[in-house]
């Protein structure tokens, strides 16, 4: 599932390159292992912003699929309460390219621990 999430992120990156979206997104670029589920939640919420701002059907479908995949992969620990983690709004705002790169890094963390 996580490998498919990375494929979807690459697809989103390719789709966005042909568009002009200037959004800045809350991005966790240095995820602590004890806050990875919280960080993933922030990434997924911000991904929905990309979908809405793009107005593109392919991006919309890919984001929706990515959320479905992540949900199923995290169904066992998605409701774990992580303490001492940053709120999404406390994270640094970065451009879409940097956001997607950081997203791939956190997904790699989940792959490495699964």
């Amino acid at each position: 599932n996580w490998v498919n999430v990375i494929s979807d992120l690459k697809k989103i990156e390719d789709l966005i390159q042909s568009m002009h979206i200037d959004a800045t997104l809350y991005t966790e670029s240095d995820v602590h292992p004890s806050c990875k589920v919280t960080a993933m939640k922030c990434f997924l919420l911000e991904l929905q912003v990309i979908s809405l701002e793009s107005g593109d059907a392919s991006i919309h479908d890919t984001v929706e699929n990515l959320i479905i995949l992540a949900n199923n992969s995290l169904s066992s620990n998605g409701n774990v309460t992580e303490s001492g983690c940053k709120e999404c709004e406390e994270l640094e705002e970065k451009n879409i390219k940097e956001f997607l790169q950081s997203f791939v890094h956190i997904v790699q963390m989940f792959i490495n621990t699964s």
């Epitope: 589920v37 993933m40 939640k41 997924l44 919420l45 929905q48 979908s51 809405l52 059907a57 392919s58 919309h60 479908d61 890919t62 984001v63 929706e64 699929n65 959320i67 479905i68 992540a70 949900n71 199923n72 995290l74 169904s75 998605g78 409701n79």
Partner: antibody, heavy 122, light 112 residues
């Protein structure tokens, strides 16, 4: 008023195939994900398949995975369910339903067709 | 898979009286983004299912305000404040937070 008309049901032998159709009208079909849900005689509802707006992504329960294929033709405003290797336990009324977007709405099935009966028997 | 368990399976109610249906999931159905995709559907005799409530407590358009949804985590409830004759049928809860999406067994509401 949103309209969904399921068709294609009938009697088929075990191991046989059938293709169901669902004609959509009075809404922009390509803006919605779609699902199939079935109901065996006298039983409850069972989710069968979901397809994304553009048709790139499909989802199934294990009970039909590898045997059923959901697809769509947005130019014809039509949803399909190709059913292969049919079994007696696939006997049911099959409903098509429109899905609200997870991102912009509630991810619910807000409108349903009238259903088409599939009977698998020798 | 997430198992949805409804109770009671049969619910005889007097016209004008309240009714309550419980739905319990085998695990939390709060998804990673914090949403709970729990719906309630009504199926009148001989008819297709109809959406009543989505995301736990949101009433779908055209649904009378005597229907209300509540709950969180694993425990959910559909309430009808005053049952009317047209409410007869089977009520299903449904989760689509996690694939495979699953329905409860259904609760048959009938008039006493």
């Amino acid at each position: 008023e949103v309209r969904l008309m399921a068709s294609g049901g009938g009697l088929v032998q075990p191991g046989g195939s059938l293709r169901l159709s669902c004609a959509a009208s009075e809404f922009t079909f390509s803006n919605y994900a779609m699902s199939w849900v079935r109901q065996a005689p006298g039983k409850g509802l069972e989710w069968v398949a979901t397809i994304s707006r553009g048709g790139d992504y499909t989802y199934y329960p294990d009970s039909v995975k590898g045997r059923f294929t959901i697809s769509r033709d947005n130019s014809k405003n039509t949803l399909y369910l190709q059913m292969n290797s049919l079994r007696a336990e696939d006997t049911a009324v099959y409903y098509c339903a429109r899905r609200v977007s997870m991102i912009t709405g509630g991810w619910a099935m807000d409108y349903w067709g009238q259903g088409t009966l599939v009977t698998v028997s020798s | 898979d997430v198992v949805m368990t409804q109770s009671p399976l049969s619910l005889p109610v007097t016209l004008g009286q309240p009714a309550s249906i419980s739905c319990r999931s085998s695990q939390s159905i709060v998804d990673i983004t914090g949403n709970t995709y729990l719906e309630w559907y009504q199926q009148r005799p001989g008819q297709s299912p109809r959406l009543l409530i989505y995301k736990v407590f949101n009433r779908f358009s055209g649904v009378p305000d005597r229907f209300s949804g509540s709950g969180s985590g694993t425990d959910f409830t559909l309430k009808i404040s005053r049952v009317e004759a047209e409410d007869v049928g089977v009520y299903y809860c449904f989760q689509d937070s996690f694939v495979p999406y699953t329905f409860g067994q259904g609760t048959k509401l009938e008039i006493k």
